[in-house]
């Protein structure tokens, strides 16, 4: 049997050591003990007695099925306890009585049906994070379960086989910053929602089939809910249940962010928010994020005209990797307050983009992200976006563009352009001179000779440049990142010719460690202030005897350098 390995600060690692019991020889010097992925099965009352100063105890996936009632009695300093993914079919309040310093407790993934006969947590007054439940057996949440807990930063409950929720069970916790609920269906959702309205700031609902969700008025008095964010992950919705969910918003008037991640919509987008009050109550929602939305019949999807009015005040919208090929012109015109739009990883082409960015579309838009779509012509894309009078930032990275022409038109306020991973081989005057930030990283550029008088930041890593670009091209440059090119050297003159340069990242290039380069790096200790990735990323490529040495450590041969 292997032994623990401990460092000088008392952090001990015993993961995956085939322990069949808590190892002997534990001491008060130990601050952290990780015994995950073992086959311990049993923790006796004296096994941890010596660990009086232990702050972290991790026993994840160690096949534990029995813990004696007083096994943790000496762990008064313990702040972090992870008992997840073990075989504990029942939980005992006596384990937690002595753990008055505990801040983090993970009991998830054990096969208990309830949290125990009596309240587990009354003494855990410092608890900040609690994770409970499992996929298959945890079936009941009761009023006694959270007694004693008044405030939590994070509460995660995996109740995917929930059969009974006792009303007001979660109400006793007065303040929960982030509640994650794994519920397989919506049966108890309204009851739970009523109980957490006045306490939860961020509610995340996971893996829930909401297809049959039906709203009914909540039995609550006028509450001022602190909820700012609502997220659905891995959930299933229909057009009808979406309408029903919208009705919950009347209870969370401070909501500012809604997120749908990896959800499925078994519908056509035929939403009909029937009640006009819903529209006004969406008033404070500023951010809507949708990622990986799966719509089996996306080719029959409606134009969303029924929800135009819902989104008039929204400032940030992300719809990522969801087969978007068109935002109808009339929809774009309704998004009057929109400042940020991210349509990454979709199916946009110039022809449909033209309809989306029609006259009057997105009048307040400042940032547009069209990364990884099906755009081909930089010239057409720029021209189409001329309608966006307030656009300052455009990301069209990860599109495969045809070679760029000599001249293009762009929105006049544009200051930031991301052309990374677009396969470009040459930069031409198509790129606007108004730019302050340009990203052309991960392309096939072997030179850069474009005058950009206002450019403050240039990102040109992962290309094929052999030298730093000429400083006269960028008179006000502050930041240049040119990692992973074929740059062989840089000199005092080169760096000195960038009058305002504050940050240079030039590591992982093919440096020829010549006498000049090594002399310069030895004589210039201030390099560390400008080269942010110095010294570890600056290695000699040649001569062979110095290959792999850091420039900082490499010493030129006296013979070579003083001939």
């Amino acid at each position: 049997q292997e032994s623990l390995s401990c460092d000088a600060s008392g952090v001990c690692d015993g993961r995956s050591r085939s322990f069949t019991s808590i190892p002997s020889g534990l001491t008060a010097a130990m601050k952290s003990l990780d015994l995950s992925f073992n086959k311990i099965t049993y923790i006796g009352h004296g096994d941890l007695r010596a660990c009086a100063n232990l702050q972290v105890l991790i026993l994840k996936s160690s096949r534990i099925n029995t813990i004696e009632g007083d096994a943790f009695y000496s762990l008064g300093s313990l702040e972090h306890l992870d008992l997840s993914d073990n075989h504990l079919s029942s939980l005992s309040s006596s384990w937690f009585g002595p753990l008055s310093s505990l801040k983090y407790l993970n009991l998830m993934g054990n096969p208990y049906q309830t949290l125990g006969v009596t309240s587990l947590f009354p003494n855990l007054t410092n608890l900040q994070t609690l994770r409970i439940g499992n996929v298959e057996t945890f079936s009941e949440i009761r009023r006694i379960d959270f007694a004693g807990l008044t405030s939590l930063n994070e509460l995660e409950i995996k109740a995917l086989s929930l059969r009974n929720y006792q009303s007001q069970s979660l109400k006793s916790i007065r303040d929960i910053h982030h509640l994650t609920l794994h519920l397989s269906e919506s049966a108890f959702l309204l009851e739970i929602f009523a109980d957490i309205l006045s306490s939860v700031r961020y509610l995340e609902l996971r893996d829930t089939n909401l297809a049959r969700f039906q709203f009914s008025p909540l039995p609550v008095d006028e509450v001022s809910s602190p909820m700012k964010k609502l997220a659905f992950r891995g959930s299933v919705l229909t057009d009808e249940s979406f309408n029903e969910l919208l009705k919950l918003l009347r209870y969370i008037l401070e909501l500012s962010e809604v997120e749908f991640d990896d959800c499925t919509l078994n519908g056509l987008g035929d939403f009909n928010p029937s009640e006009s009050d819903v529209v006004s109550e969406l008033g404070k929602v500023e951010t809507v994020t949708i990622r990986r939305l799966h719509i089996p019949q996306f080719y029959l999807f409606y134009d969303l005209s029924t929800v135009y009015s819902l989104l008039e005040k929204v400032k940030r919208i992300t719809v990522e990797n969801s087969k978007v090929f068109l935002v109808p012109c009339s929809f774009s015109q309704h998004l009057k307050s929109l400042e940020f739009l991210d349509l990454s990883e979709n199916l946009m082409v110039e022809e449909y983009l033209k309809n989306s960015a029609c006259k009057g579309a997105w009048p307040s838009l400042q940032t547009l992200v069209l990364s990884q779509n099906h755009l081909r012509s930089m010239q057409k894309t720029g021209e189409i976006l001329l309608t966006l009078k307030n656009l300052t930032s455009l990301d069209i990275s990860r599109n495969t563009f045809h070679p760029m022409p000599d001249s293009c038109q762009w929105p006049e306020k544009m200051r930031f352009l991301n052309l990374s991973s677009t396969g470009i081989r040459v930069v031409k005057t198509c790129i606007p001179q108004t730019l302050e930030v340009l990203d052309v990283s991960n392309n096939n550029l072997d030179s850069f000779s474009l005058f950009l008088p206002r450019l403050q930041e240039l990102y040109i890593s992962r290309n094929k440049l052999k030298t730093l670009p000429d400083a006269s091209l960028f008179p006000v440059l502050l930041v240049m990142k040119i990692r992973e090119n074929a740059v062989s050297t840089f000199s005092k003159d080169q760096l000195g010719s960038f009058p305002k340069l504050e940050t240079l990242e030039a590591g992982d290039n093919h440096f020829v460690c010549s006498c000049e380069l090594l002399s310069f790096t030895m004589e210039t200790p201030a390099l560390a202030q400008i080269l942010v990735d110095w010294p570890d990323s600056y290695l000699c490529d040649s001569p062979p005897r110095l290959h792999g040495h850091r420039l900082q450590d490499a010493r030129p041969s006296v013979l070579e350098c003083h001939q």
């Epitope: 079936s139 397989s184 891995g234």
Partner: nanobody, 122 residues
Framework: EVQLVESGGGLVQAGGSLRLSCAAS????????MSWFRQAPGKEREFVAV????????DYSTSVKGRFTIFRDNAKNTVYLETTSLELEDTAVYYC???????????????WGQGTPVTVSS
């Protein structure tokens, strides 16, 4: 109505691996949550693993976590269970199940296969 057919079971030595497959008929496969359960001789049927509609969420029973992997290919209407580091206690008939709800509770699954036997020998 979805029909499920499991395959890939067999005799394997302790420490070995098997890939179990479950082929589904019907065009609505991607709408189903898919699960694997198992039943050892003389014991109750127990949950093994579950995967959601898209494959974005997976969960495992404690006894197989870290050793088994569930994944699905919606284009092929198939869900798989990759089993590694097999132990004697893994000997059972393995069933795949399809349902509307992401859960480890067998009662919530409407469609079941006929099972494929896995025998782990020392």
């Amino acid at each position: 109505e979805v029909q499920l057919v499991e395959s890939g079971g067999g005799l394997v030595q302790a420490g070995g691996s098997l890939r179990l497959s479950c082929a589904a008929s019907g065009r609505t496969f991607s709408r189903y949550v898919m699960s694997w359960f198992r039943q050892a001789p003389g014991k109750e049927r127990e949950f093994v693993a579950v995967i959601n509609w898209s494959g974005g969420s997976t969960d495992y029973s404690t006894s197989v976590k870290g050793r088994f992997t569930i994944f699905r290919d919606n284009a092929k209407n198939t869900v798989y269970l990759e089993t590694t580091s097999l132990e004697l206690e893994d000997t059972a008939v393995y069933y795949c199940a399809a349902g509307e709800y992401y859960t480890g509770a067998s009662s919530r699954y409407d469609h079941w296969g006929q099972g494929t036997p896995v025998t782990v020998s020392s």
